[in-house]
């Protein structure tokens, strides 16, 4: 019997290079399937499949082609009628728009368009247009749409082609043509600066063309190895240090990329001579010194050695060593009117340069001039004269009384002086003074002048003024400009105190004497001390005033928040009072109150309850402060009861009421007594009470009642009042 045809043969999935087939198994028994499908070329391909197969994928097909498929069941030599189906593969996505977007001298950039996520990879072929030599192949991922093709020859035409690969299938090839650009060249190279051990090289080049520049520095005419340097491609200038002085160099520069180096540019240069010290000059010349100046680059030498030699003399030269930072030097100690040769050596770590030399003649000796007597005293004179600076070793001055032939007085003075005081002369006497200078044993001509001393100095008119309890002022008269000091002695008339002595400047004509006891008689002695003389002593008397009285510091009306301070003082004795309140623990800032000299009490409020205070009161008179009076007080002390009121008064009784103080108290004690006298009666009530009944009184008698608050051992100030029984 005939075999059943496979049932329901159909194409379930189509792709660009595959078709998926499905079918159902026939009822009759069979051994296998035979699957045949046609290729676009007309050929047929056959595949044998196991009997249990119900699907199959045809792979490796071409996109966009129609395929005929026949499926037959076979048993032995028997075949069923074929099941047939026709299907087409999907159209392949297009690869298009191949363009060369950037052209460099050694590479190109390719761009193309293609469907997204379609391709496994692209194959790009690059070939010189006019050459048959092997093309260069590049495989790039299917996700790319552009690629750089480096490593090409400059100024060369290229053919570039591309195809995509999809599951082994190649798309049609796209091609494009492009030529690479001309090789970029270095521009010009110049030596911008030349030194003796370095130079600066500048060059031009296209921006971004080179990764780096390779510079070679070669000594001309030597086989010595060149000095090589590489500098970044962004630079157009570099310093070349460490060269030899006065040497010919050939410098070459190349631009370098990964696989290309430009033709080198060269430049020749001669470095400068080593900078020697130069311009040794003498800028200032005096009779015994000169100033040298010289030039040299900074940092060249550690130090300089200067040699100073008298010309035409064989005696040893004078050597000086100075720091390498100096460019100038003063050479002192030379002879006047003398030719010198000065040489200068530079030095580096002990190595000495060849010398520079200069010749110079010092000036002639200076002269003294203008001797004058500028000040005349009673026992001395002041001389002034002029002379060249730093010229003289010393001066010799001779002083002689004009009308006497006795030996003259000689003085030797340092050469730096231009004035001197001549002491120890007689008052009101004419003198002749002469002077000469000495320079290394040589004496200048003598200069002379005449002058008379003044009369002897005097003091007088010793006055006492501005007497206070502890001080007074002195004033006196004295000859001006003579006295060095005045001595003042203060002695009390009763000789109970030690003598006090003051030495004060001779320029003063007043003195303030303080620190004296009040109400004391003093004798003041004054004498003046001038060079070689003490004047006769003059005297005056003085009595210090009595000290104003400040006494009886009293604290009253103590309550939790304050108290009243009062004191006694002499009338009109004080300008002001200072009251200072300090807590005993010194935890708070002191409070100061300045009161006028007429006040005698101060009410203090706003203090802290339950702490101790120290109160100090001092008086001020003419700026002087008395020693303070002191008292201590505690604000916890009881506040006094207030506002005593009497009511319900009968012949032998009455009710007394009061207002309790702010702070809590334990009890109140009420004392009452007839005003005319007698034994006081007393009653104590609980601290919470504010009234009590007074009984057993005498009719028609005035009673004085006083109430105090009590707490422990403390008692308040009393509050009082009076009433009369009926």
């Amino acid at each position: 019997s005939e075999l059943d045809t496979p049932k329901d043969l159909q194409v379930s999935e189509t792709a660009e290079t595959s078709l998926t087939l499905l079918w159902k198994t026939p009822l009759a028994k069979f051994d296998r399937y035979r699957l045949n499908y046609s290729l676009p070329t007309g050929q047929w391909v056959g595949v044998q499949l196991p009997r249990n197969t119900t699907s199959y994928v045809l792979r490796g097909l071409e996109p966009g082609q129609e395929y005929n498929v026949l499926l037959t069941a076979e048993k032995g030599r028997h075949k069923s009628k074929p099941a047939r189906v026709k299907a087409s593969t999907e159209q392949a996505p297009e690869l298009e728009n191949l363009t060369v977007t950037e052209v460099g001298w050694d590479g190109l950039r390719l761009n193309w368009t293609a469907a997204d996520q379609a391709y496994e990879h692209f194959i790009i072929q690059v070939q010189e247009a006019n050459k048959v030599e092997a093309a260069r192949n590049l495989t790039v991922p299917g996700s790319l749409r552009a690629v750089d093709i480096p490593g090409l020859k400059a100024a060369t035409p290229y053919t570039v082609s591309i195809y995509g690969v999809i599951q082994g299938y190649r798309t049609p090839v796209l091609s494009a043509e492009a030529s690479t650009g001309e090789t970029p060249n270095l521009g010009e190279v110049v030596v911008a600066e030349v030194g003796w051990d370095a130079l600066k090289l500048n060059w031009t080049a296209p921006e971004g063309a080179y990764e780096y520049f390779f510079i070679q520095v070669q000594e001309a005419d030597t086989v010595e190895a060149a000095q090589n340097l590489t500098v970044p491609g962004g630079l157009r200038s570099t310093d070349l240090p460490g060269l030899k002085a006065a040497t010919h160099y050939t410098i070459t520069i190349r631009g370098v990329t990964q696989d290309f180096s430009t033709t080198p540019l060269s430049v020749e240069v001669l470095t400068e001579e080593v900078p020697d010290m130069g311009n040794l000059t003498v800028t200032e010349v005096s009779w015994d010194a000169l100033r040298l100046n010289w030039t040299t680059p900074d940092g060249t030498y550690d130090q300089f050695t200067i040699q100073v030699q008298e010309a035409d003399q064989v005696e040893e030269a004078h050597n000086l060593t100075v720091p390498g930072s100096l460019r100038s030097m003063e050479i002192p100690g030379l002879r006047a009117g003398t030719p010198y040769t000065v040489t200068l050596h530079g030095e580096v770590r002990g190595h000495s340069t060849r010398p520079l030399a200069v010749e110079v003649v010092t000036e002639d000796l200076p002269q003294l001039g203008d001797l004058a007597v500028s000040e005349v005293g009673w026992d001395g004179l002041r001389l002034n004269w002029t002379a060249a600076d730093n010229a003289y070793e010393h001066f010799v001055i001779q002083v002689q009384e004009v009308n006497k032939v006795e030996a003259a007085q000689n003085l030797t003075l340092p050469g730096s002086l231009r004035a001197v005081d001549i002491p120890g002369l007689e008052a009101a006497t004419p003198y002749r003074v002469s002077i000469y200078g000495v320079i290394r044993g040589y004496r200048t001509p003598v200069l002379s002048a005449e002058a008379s001393t003044a009369k002897e100095p005097e003091i007088g008119n010793l006055n006492v003024s501005d007497i206070t309890p502890e001080s007074f002022n002195l004033s006196w008269m004295a000859t001006d400009g003579i006295f060095e000091t005045f001595t003042i002695e203060i002695i009390d008339s009763n000789r109970l105190l030690e003598t006090v002595e003051y030495n004060i400047s001779g320029a003063e004509r007043t003195a303030h004497i303080s620190g004296l006891p009040p109400s004391t008689d003093f004798i003041v002695y004054l004498s003046g001390l001038a060079p070689s003389i003490r004047t006769k002593t003059i005297s005056a008397t003085a009595t210090t005033e009595a000290l104003p009285l400040l006494e009886n510091l009293t604290i009253s009306d103590i309550n939790p928040y304050g108290f009243t301070v009062s004191w006694m003082a002499s009338e009109n004795a004080f300008d002001s009072f200072l009251v200072t309140v300090v807590d005993s623990g010194k935890l708070l800032d002191p409070q100061e109150f300045t009161l006028s000299g007429t006040q005698r009490k101060l009410e203090l409020r706003g203090l802290i309850t339950g702490i101790g205070y120290e109160v100090m009161v001092s008086g001020f008179t003419q700026g002087h402060q008395t020693k303070p009076l002191r008292a201590e007080i505690v604000t916890e002390a009881m506040g006094s009861p207030k506002e005593v009121i009497f009511s319900d008064i009968t012949e032998n009784s009455a009710t007394v009421s009061w207002r309790a103080p702010t702070a809590q108290v334990e009890s109140f004690r009420i004392t009452y007594v007839p005003i005319t006298g007698g034994t006081p009666s007393m009653v104590t009530v609980d601290g919470t009470k504010t009234q009590t009944r007074l009984v057993k009184l005498i009719p028609g008698v005035e009673y004085l009642v006083s109430i105090i608050a009590m707490k422990g051992f403390e008692e308040s100030e009393p509050v009082s009042g009076s009433f009369t029984t009926a």
Epitope: T305, H351, S352, R354
Partner: antibody
Framework: EVQLLESGGGLVQPGGSLRLSCAAS????????MSWVRQAPGKGLEWVSA????????YYADSVKGRFTISKDNSKNTLYLQMNSLRAEDTAVYYC???????????WGQGTLVTVSS | SSELTQDPAVSVALGQTVRVTCQGD??????ASWYQQKPGQAPVLVIY???NRPSGIPDRFSGSSSGNTASLTITGAQAEDEADYYC??????????FGGGTKLTVLS
């Protein structure tokens, strides 16, 4: 009497480090510049490095620049040469020498041998 | 190569005068210093500056300078003068430079 005594030489592998010391006596160490000079076996003298009296200025030969460091401790009267990244061509006797004003390299130590070899 | 150039070897008959020379650019500006080194010993300064001898150096040693050349002269060479002689100066970068050295042989 001026005395200079080098120490710290020895055998070291290429790329290794060594520190030479030079103990000085008989002069005010802080007032004088000092130098290191080396001499390869059978070869001439080669200046290596110098330092000013205070230690504030240092100088190096191109062949050792960046690898060697000269220093001095004036409180210990000692000169040092720290040698890093040593090469076979650094093999030499290393001398320390004193410099006086106007007198270069006036006193030398007896030297210490440094051998750089694998 | 060294910045100071010396003849590698010089010989002199005992008692005769010999001159050892040293050439280099830095000698136009600086005086050379001269060092004597005997085998196995440290160098010893023999001449510095224009023509100065440290104490203990015999007066048969002298120095001179002209242009870019410095000379060490030994007048009446002695057997103990046989040694290597090195010249030394300062270059433009303030670094010390030594000549390659001259081996002096005294022939008896």
């Amino acid at each position: 009497e001026v005395q200079l005594l080098e120490s710290g030489g020895g055998l070291v592998q290429p790329g290794g480090s060594l520190r030479l010391s030079c103990a000085a006596s008989g002069f005010t160490f802080s007032s004088y510049a000092m130098s290191w000079v080396r001499q390869a076996p059978g070869k001439g003298l080669e200046w290596v490095s110098a330092i000013s009296g205070s230690g504030g200025s240092t100088y190096y030969a191109d062949s050792v620049k960046g690898r060697f460091t000269i220093s001095k401790d004036n409180s210990k009267n000692t000169l040092y040469l720290q040698m890093n990244s040593l090469r076979a061509e650094d093999t030499a006797v290393y001398y320390c020498a004193k410099t006086s004003p106007r007198v270069p390299l006036d006193y030398w130590g007896q030297g210490t041998l440094v051998t750089v070899s694998s | 190569s060294s910045e100071l150039t010396q003849d590698p070897a010089v010989s002199v008959a005992l008692g005769q005068t010999v001159r050892v020379t040293c050439q280099g650019d830095s000698l136009r500006s600086y005086y050379a210093s001269w060092y004597q080194q005997k085998p196995g010993q440290a160098p010893v300064l023999v001449i510095y500056g224009k023509n100065n001898r440290p104490s203990g150096i015999p007066d048969r040693f002298s120095g001179s300078s002209s242009g870019n050349t410095a000379s060490l002269t030994i007048t009446g060479a002695q057997a103990e003068d046989e040694a290597d002689y090195y010249c030394n100066s300062i270059n433009s970068t303030r670094n010390e430079v030594f000549g390659g050295g001259t081996k002096l042989t005294v022939l008896s």
